[in-house]
């Protein structure tokens, strides 16, 4: 908290401008109107300001917009904003992309901080959904803010906004993630043909029922091992050795080297011998031959 | 990306010294500079500054006519020629670019 004392004589700031970094602090606060301050929040960022004298600067806006800042001034905070704190931010109501985007480039380079989540926060949910336009923004500056989000959030994520999703937007997602977004990328893609289809819809197949695997497997789509290890397990497990050696077309032979691994080591568990050594990979652990298999499941349903 | 000031020493009074402020991963053309001081125990203050074109320049009350701010775009770097050194100089020096000052800083003793 700074001092309240009188502005000397001849140092009344006129306009926002390079002289005030000379100014001590005290001087900033006493000699920089809050309301000059708020019309000139542009010319702030061309300043180099101490940390010290953007503090009263934040400082004097506080005082002046006790409520939260109006959209014309978050636009120009620049570097200032990195001086907000969340609960600053949860005052504000941004609702333009322009000042998202100026807000998120003075972060550029950075992990995604507490002030940045909040701000991402307040926005969308002043939009009441991530449409296209948000999601390519966010996923350009945050490349993993998709799977950032609950299940619960990324329900409003609307079919059209699935076109912004590059593949490495989902690289830290979770199954229960992918559950959510694979309907959405399935209805988003529905009028593509089967070659681009299968590229488009490649990354989200880890929320991927095992219906639509095996109509994957009709089609030739040479599935490669580390998009297939990503699938869910219970998925999986009802595959055939036919429908997993279409799947995979000449991929087929990489099951040797993740055998122990999931979900192909259950998978492994649920086939006949006999089907495996089909495959001439020397794949181990499936049924002994004249075996009998219950599936209890199909048990319980029917009981 | 960061700036790299160097230059400081130990100089008698009255005596010079010019310290640099180095651009590291981005070009300093389009930038404002500050050089900024701080020392022991005082509040960082303001020295100099120059304009990006270099068109326009400003220097706090304390060191007007002994301090120069100069800059040489293609070798990335502002420069601060520091004459008539006095006691009261001895700080360590920052520099930033339109942004706070984020570098280590040279130390300058004026003994």
């Known amino acids: 908290e700074v001092e309240k004392t009188a502005c000397p004589s001849g140092k009344k700031a006129r306009e926002i401008d390079e002289s005030l970094i000379f100014y001590k602090k005290w001087e900033l606060e006493a000699c920089v109107d809050a309301a000059l301050l708020a019309t000139q929040m542009d010319r702030v960022n061309a300043i180099p300001f101490t940390y010290e004298q953007l503090d009263v600067l934040k400082h004097k806006l506080d005082e002046l917009y006790p409520q939260g800042y109006p959209e014309s001034v978050i636009q120009h905070l620049g570097y200032l904003f990195l001086k907000m704190s969340p609960e600053d931010i949860r005052k504000w109501n941004v609702t333009s992309l322009e000042t998202l985007k100026a807000l998120l480039e003075v972060n550029k380079g950075h992990e995604m901080s507490p002030q940045v989540a909040t701000l991402i926060d307040r926005f969308v949910k002043g939009r009441g959904q991530l449409d296209k336009d948000t999601l390519d923004t966010l996923t350009a500056f945050y490349p993993g803010y998709l799977c950032s989000l609950s299940p619960e959030e990324l329900s409003s994520v609307p079919p059209s906004s699935i076109w912004a999703v590059r593949p490495q937007d989902l690289d830290t997602c979770d199954p229960r993630q992918l559950d959510v977004l694979y309907p959405k990328a399935r209805l988003a893609f529905q009028n593509m043909n089967g070659s681009e289809y299968f590229v488009k819809i490649q990354s989200f197949l880890g929320g991927a029922p095992t219906e639509d695997l095996k109509a994957l497997s009709q089609q030739n789509v040479s599935m490669d091992l580390a998009t297939f290890m990503k699938l869910r397990t219970d998925a999986v497990l009802p595959l055939t050795v036919a429908e997993v050696q279409k799947l995979l077309g000449p991929h087929v032979e990489g099951l040797k080297a993740e055998e122990r691994h999931r979900p192909v080591r259950d998978w492994i568990l649920r086939q006949r011998q006999d089907d495996l050594d089909t495959l001439g990979l020397g794949l181990q652990g499936g049924i002994p031959n004249g075996y009998l298999v219950l599936d209890l499941s199909m048990q319980e349903a029917l009981s | 990306l960061q700036l790299v000031e160097s230059g400081g020493g130990l100089v008698q009074p009255g005596g010079s010294l010019r310290l640099s402020c180095a651009a590291s991963g981005f070009t300093l053309d389009y930038f404002a500079i500050g050089w900024f001081r701080q020392a022991p125990g005082k509040e960082r203050e303001g020295v100099s500054y120059i304009s990006s074109s270099g068109g326009s320049t400003n220097y706090a009350d304390s060191v007007k006519g002994r301090f120069t701010i100069s800059r040489d775009n293609a070798k990335n770097t502002v420069y601060l020629q520091m004459n008539s050194l006095k006691p009261e100089d001895t700080a360590v020096y920052y520099c930033?670019?339109?942004?706070?000052?984020g570098g280590q800083g040279t130390l300058v003793t004026v003994s």
């Open positions: 930033a670019a339109d942004w706070p000052p």
